[in-house]
């Protein structure tokens, strides 16, 4: 991690992917410490601010412009050497986002997957991007990069993620770059949450007043478990979104969430999952499916009494 013999290690916090106008801290780690260091940009563009300047512990760059994108290296202070400086560090690529229209990001077969499965994340755009980049929120490593395939006026790339483990769950975004500006990326795609299920014991799902109800009757689905889940997620077969609620401890030592569905119109098959606050994208096994039947004259689909989560937002904490 820390580079070789006389080589410092240059890293970026929080990430090498920086939005236009944002800030990033560059750290040059040399000889088991953060010493004084000098910075260089390989293409020498834009950075008069570096020339002859010595930085202490970290360099805060920003607000960044497209011209900040590129490859950086540092040299650590080495007072007793001939030059006074170490060998150059590893190259660090800083990518600046927000320079072109955002691409779209889709998951095949879908964003809800079992542990061990593989998912294809497809990034596509009608902008002729040469490369696509896939980045997971909260990690400082460089994003994955693929060459875009152009077909019928659309450029796209398929990123294969798997076999899925808890560490791969999270919020993904993709970006595109055009030829000649490889590190000036597009605006981010809408976030896509990849959720891994099957890691903990399944909760139980029940309906009040029961699974068979009269049209117009109020129905509540209760998800509960002996496991101390923080959040429960309720999904309905055929619907893209899920609802979530905070789990409440009950006197019988179970943890429960009650989802009010409102007046019954259409039935459906429901499942619920539990998750912990620390790993919001890692869910339990699915509860046994619960078929809710509505007798009488169904009109339209069931109303949503609460604002449903869309394909994104699942991996954010529920405050």
């Amino acid at each position: 991690l820390m580079g070789g013999q006389d080589k410092p290690f240059l890293s970026a916090r929080p990430s090498t992917v920086v939005p236009r106008g944002g800030h990033v801290a560059l750290q040059c780690h040399y000889r088991r410490g953060f010493n004084n260091f000098m910075l260089y940009k390989e293409d020498r563009s834009h950075v008069p601010i570096f020339h002859g300047r010595i930085f202490q512990e970290s360099f805060i760059m920003g607000p960044v412009t497209p011209a900040h994108a590129g490859t950086y290296r540092c040299r650590g202070s080495r007072p007793h050497s001939l030059t006074g400086w170490s060998a150059p560090s590893n190259p660090l690529v800083i990518m600046v986002t927000g320079n072109h229209r955002k691409p779209s990001l889709l998951a095949h077969p879908g964003p809800l997957l079992k542990s061990g499965e593989t998912v294809i994340l497809q990034c596509w755009s009608d902008v002729m991007f040469e490369h696509f980049f896939l980045h997971r929120e909260g990690i400082s490593e460089d994003p994955s990069r693929l060459v875009g395939q152009i077909h019928d006026g659309v450029s796209k790339a398929n990123f294969s993620i798997g076999p899925l483990m808890p560490v791969l769950a999270g919020t993904y975004r993709c970006y595109g770059s055009v030829p000649h500006s490889p590190y000036q990326l597009s605006a981010p795609s809408d976030p896509l949450d990849i959720v891994i299920t099957g890691l903990y014991e399944k909760p139980s799902l029940s309906a009040q007043p029961g699974p068979t109800v009269q049209a117009g009757e109020n129905v509540t689905l209760s998800c509960s478990s002996w496991s101390s889940y923080d959040i429960y997620h309720l999904s309905r077969e055929g619907e893209a979104h899920e609802r979530r609620l905070r789990a409440v401890p009950k006197v019988n030592r179970t943890f429960q969430a009650d989802f009010p569905l409102g007046p019954a119109t259409h039935g459906g098959t429901y499942r619920c999952f539990g998750s912990f606050r620390a790993l919001p994208c890692v869910w339990s096994n699915s509860s046994d499916p619960l078929l809710v039947s509505v007798t009488g004259n169904p009109s339209s689909s069931w109303p949503s009494p609460t604002e449903p989560s869309s394909k994104s937002g699942i991996c954010r904490h529920l405050h």
């Epitope: 801290a25 360099f59 805060i60 760059m61 607000p63």
Partner: antibody, heavy 118, light 107 residues
Framework: QVQLVQSGSELKKPGASVKVSCKAS????????MQWVQKSPGQGLEWMGW????????KYAEDFKGRFVFSLDTSVSTAYLQISSLKAEDTAVYFC???????????WGQGTTVTVSS | DIVMTQSPSFLSASVGDRVTITCKAS??????VAWYQQKPGQPPKLLIY???TRHTGVPDRFSGSGSGTDYTLTISSVQAEDVAVYYC?????????FGGGTKVEIK
């Protein structure tokens, strides 16, 4: 959205100390620094120095070395300016502003008026 | 220290006029110049940095240009809400230094 909220006005006697706070929100506090700028009555803007919120290392302009101290409490995303042995000429509005090694100050606090008078 | 000499110190313009404020650095500052707007009773607001990069949310009637020691802020069609003091600042080398300010008034 990025916001910097400074503590209220202060009236102090010569020789006293004052501590001005600047609470940041809307961004990751440790990825940027905090610059401090003084605006004395009838004068322009004068850069006092800054503190790197990632490393905690402060840097002071020549005229502000000695009685002026920058500090941080990253747990509450707050930067502080402490001035000791106050003099009448320290009477000014003090601004905090987000910025890093490149010296661009992209968001500013509302300013804190410090009046030094006997 | 780098001295930033700003001119004029005061200007009066009519709504719709093109307004130009200049700043001269005492040495080459390699395009590391920012411009700020300070309205009465408010803190300064960043308009432009690296000579010509507009900050988020800044109207496109504000533009910056220049190189070497000479830099310009232009308001292509001044509006009533642009009444303020405008400051240039070099961010080439510490200590960062500001110009003396230009007060813009609407006739």
């Amino acid at each position: 959205q990025v916001q910097l909220v400074q503590s209220g006005s202060e009236l102090k006697k010569p020789g006293a100390s004052v501590k001005v706070s600047c609470k940041a929100s809307g961004y990751t506090f440790t990825t940027a620094g905090m610059q401090w700028v003084q605006k004395s009555p009838g004068q322009g803007l004068e850069w006092m120095g800054w503190i790197n919120s990632h490393s905690g290392v402060p840097k002071y302009a020549e005229d502000f070395k000695g009685r002026f101290v920058f500090s941080l409490d990253t747990s509450v995303s707050t930067a502080y300016l402490q001035i000791s042995s106050l003099k009448a000429e320290d009477t000014a509005v003090y601004f905090c502003a987000r910025g890093g090694d490149e010296g661009v100050m992209d968001y500013w606090g509302q300013g804190t008026t410090v009046t030094v008078s006997s | 220290d780098i001295v930033m000499t700003q001119s004029p110190s005061f200007l009066s313009a009519s709504v719709g006029d093109r307004v130009t404020i200049t700043c001269k650095a005492s040495q080459d500052v390699s395009t590391a110049v920012a411009w700020y707007q300070q309205k009465p009773g408010q803190p300064p607001k960043l308009l432009i940095y690296w000579t010509s990069t507009r900050h988020t949310g800044v109207p496109d009637r504000f533009s910056g240009s220049g190189s070497g020691t000479d830099y310009t802020l232009t308001i292509s069609s001044v509006q009533a809400e642009d009444v303020a003091v405008y400051y240039c600042q070099q961010h080439y080398s510490t200590p960062w230094t500001f110009g003396g300010g230009t007060k813009v008034e609407i006739k």
